[in-house]
């Protein structure tokens, strides 16, 4: 009679994580008598997956009734497959004895596991940057298998080309991670912009995963300042305004200086928002010119988002105004765009 052969017909099997894997194995003879065992790998480090004779293997079930005497099908199903189950599985026939001895092995079935990538996480730089600067964004996704994956970057729907991507580990693993770094040049209009990382993988069936980062968390648009003198509102009083335009984020502190001396400090509160997401704000100072004998240098100093202060000055010509006798108050009346105190 022909000697028993162990047949594993599938050289490889690919299964999605969470599903069951069926590993086929048949023998060509009932002789010699003895159990079947399944192993992952061969050699001294092989791992027992199923023993027909004894043991508890909660994730493994036999496909046919392996307890029947005439059964020659020893295929198994492994439930709830994870990437850690990847490997080469051998169906091994043992000869009954004390102890049972290995008799024949199948050629092996390579099990690969398809696992979905995690939702991409996009992170930007730790510190804000100003327009015209290049900033880096990273995108990470983990836990996918097989290794083949496609990653794309977009800014407001436009595909970016300046990025570098690595898939780790370099070689075979139960699962993989992808890490990509994209370089983005900021513009003044980027407050409402989004950077998107898109990951496509065989397990996603054409529906890629996306991770986003809002450039509002990355960009700092420094303000432009304009100091102007308004027409005289009352006798001996001049209204000077400081227009703070096109800044982002809102965090801003303004200080008025009169000939270098601090006159008032205030924080931007009621701002107006521009279409591009930047803000405008206005502060004014009411100056009593009669209190001054000489010209007054008024400075609007702005500290935006913790950055070094920027300032704009305006020279107020006192000689053009008649001086009020007995007045020693320089700037009694001050105001801003949200309150006027007279």
């Amino acid at each position: 009679e022909e000697e028993l052969q162990v047949i594993q017909p599938d050289k490889s099997v690919s299964v999605a994580a969470g599903e069951s894997a069926i590993l086929h194995c048949t023998v060509t003879s009932l002789i010699p008598v003895g159990p079947i065992q399944w192993f992952r790998g061969a050699g001294p480090a092989r791992e027992l997956i199923y023993n027909q004779k004894e043991g508890h293997f909660p994730r493994v079930t036999t496909v046919s009734e392996s307890t029947k005497r005439e059964n020659m099908d020893f295929s198994i199903s492994i439930s709830n497959i994870t990437p850690a189950d990847a490997g080469t599985y051998y169906c091994v026939k043992f000869r009954k004895g004390s102890p049972d001895t290995e008799f024949k092995s199948g050629a092996g079935t390579e099990l690969s596991v398809r696992a979905k990538p995690s939702a991409p996480v996009v992170s930007g730089p730790a510190a804000r940057a100003t327009p015209q600067h290049t900033v880096s964004f990273t995108c990470e996704s983990h836990g996918f298998s097989p290794r083949d994956i496609t990653l794309k970057w977009f800014k407001n729907g436009n595909e970016l080309s300046d990025f570098q991507t690595n898939v780790d580990p370099v070689g075979e693993s139960v699962s993989y991670s992808i890490h990509s770094t994209a370089k983005v040049v900021l513009t003044r209009e980027d407050v409402h912009s989004q950077v998107i990382c898109e990951v496509a993988h065989v397990t996603l069936q054409g529906d890629p995963l996306r991770g986003t980062a809002n450039l509002s968390e990355t960009i700092r648009v420094p303000p432009t300042l304009e100091v102007t003198q308004q027409p005289v509102r009352a006798e001996n009083q001049v209204n000077v305004t400081c227009q703070v335009r096109k800044f982002y984020p809102q965090r801003l502190q303004l200080t008025w200086l009169e000939n270098g001396n601090v006159s008032r400090t205030e924080t931007a509160s009621t701002v107006t928002e521009n279409k591009d997401g930047t803000y405008n704000w206005m502060s004014w100072l009411l100056v009593n010119v009669s209190a001054h004998r000489d010209d007054v240098k008024l400075t609007c100093q702005v500290e935006h988002d913790g950055q070094p202060a920027v300032s704009k000055s305006h020279d107020l010509k006192v000689s053009a105004h008649p001086k009020e006798q007995g007045s020693n108050t320089a700037a009694e009346n001050t105001g801003s765009n949200e309150r006027n105190i007279y």
């Epitope: 790998g41 061969a42 050699g43 001294p44 290995e102 024949k104 092995s105």
Partner: antibody
């Protein structure tokens, strides 16, 4: 196709050090474990070490502990064998050989072999 | 260490013969045995793994058998290109060990 290409022959004096390389191509290097096997002239094969190329952890045969150092440069898909304080009995052809299993924690037989590097130790 | 004994260092054969090369393990190794062919100046070539599984592309005149401690490589129809040295290897336990080899020569 899959290839293991080893560095060329070496002629050394006793007490010197030799370092030979095995560059893998045609597959992902860390997919498969790698072994080194010694064959003295006219003699049989002697297994030296198995290296898990994914973790870099080696498993040695007792005879090859001490003067023998095995290392990997995964970015270059290369395995190295260094023999320190060479002795006459180190004269042999050294082969690198690749594992069969794509999930490399279970070394067994050897599917692919390098062409061998002859190391001659002579005063 | 497990010793793999190939008692016949040389075997004389005729083209067309059936040749059996034996290998004995000093302790039970199950079926964790591989066979290799090596020609002069070449590296070994895998023929059989798991005692009886023919590796891909190996001619079917090569057959492996045995389990436990006694193993045989059989060449059913000896060809001139089969003149070479044949080694068995156990991979049941570390350190992996090889037999000393059996060299096939033509009569």
């Amino acid at each position: 196709q899959i290839q293991l290409v080893q560095s060329g022959p070496e002629l050394k004096k006793p007490g010197e050090t030799v370092k030979i390389s095995c560059k893998a191509s045609g597959y992902t290097f860390t997919t498969y474990g790698m072994s080194w096997v010694k064959q003295a002239p006219g003699k049989g094969l002697k297994w030296m070490v198995w290296i898990n190329t994914y973790s870099g952890v080696p498993t040695y045969a007792d005879d090859f502990k001490g003067r023998f150092a095995f290392s990997l440069e995964t970015s270059a898909s290369t395995s190295y064998l260094q023999i320190n304080n060479l002795k006459n009995e180190d004269t042999a052809t050294y082969f690198c050989a690749r594992d069969p299993h794509y999930y490399g924690s279970s070394p067994a037989w050897f599917v692919y072999w390098g062409q061998g590097t002859l190391v001659t130790v002579s005063a | 260490d497990i010793v793999m004994t190939q008692s016949q260092k040389f075997m004389s054969t005729t083209i067309g013969d059936r040749v059996s090369i034996t290998c004995e393990a000093s302790q039970i190794v199950g079926i964790a045995v591989a066979w290799y062919q090596q020609k002069p100046g070449q590296s070994p070539k895998l023929l059989i793994y798991s005692a009886s599984n023919r590796y891909t592309g190996v001619p079917d005149r090569f057959t492996g058998s045995g389990s436990g401690t006694d193993f045989t490589l059989t060449i059913s129809n000896m060809q001139s290109e089969d003149l070479a040295n044949y080694f068995c290897q156990q991979y049941s336990a570390y350190p992996f060990t090889f037999g000393s080899g059996t060299k096939l020569e033509v009569k």
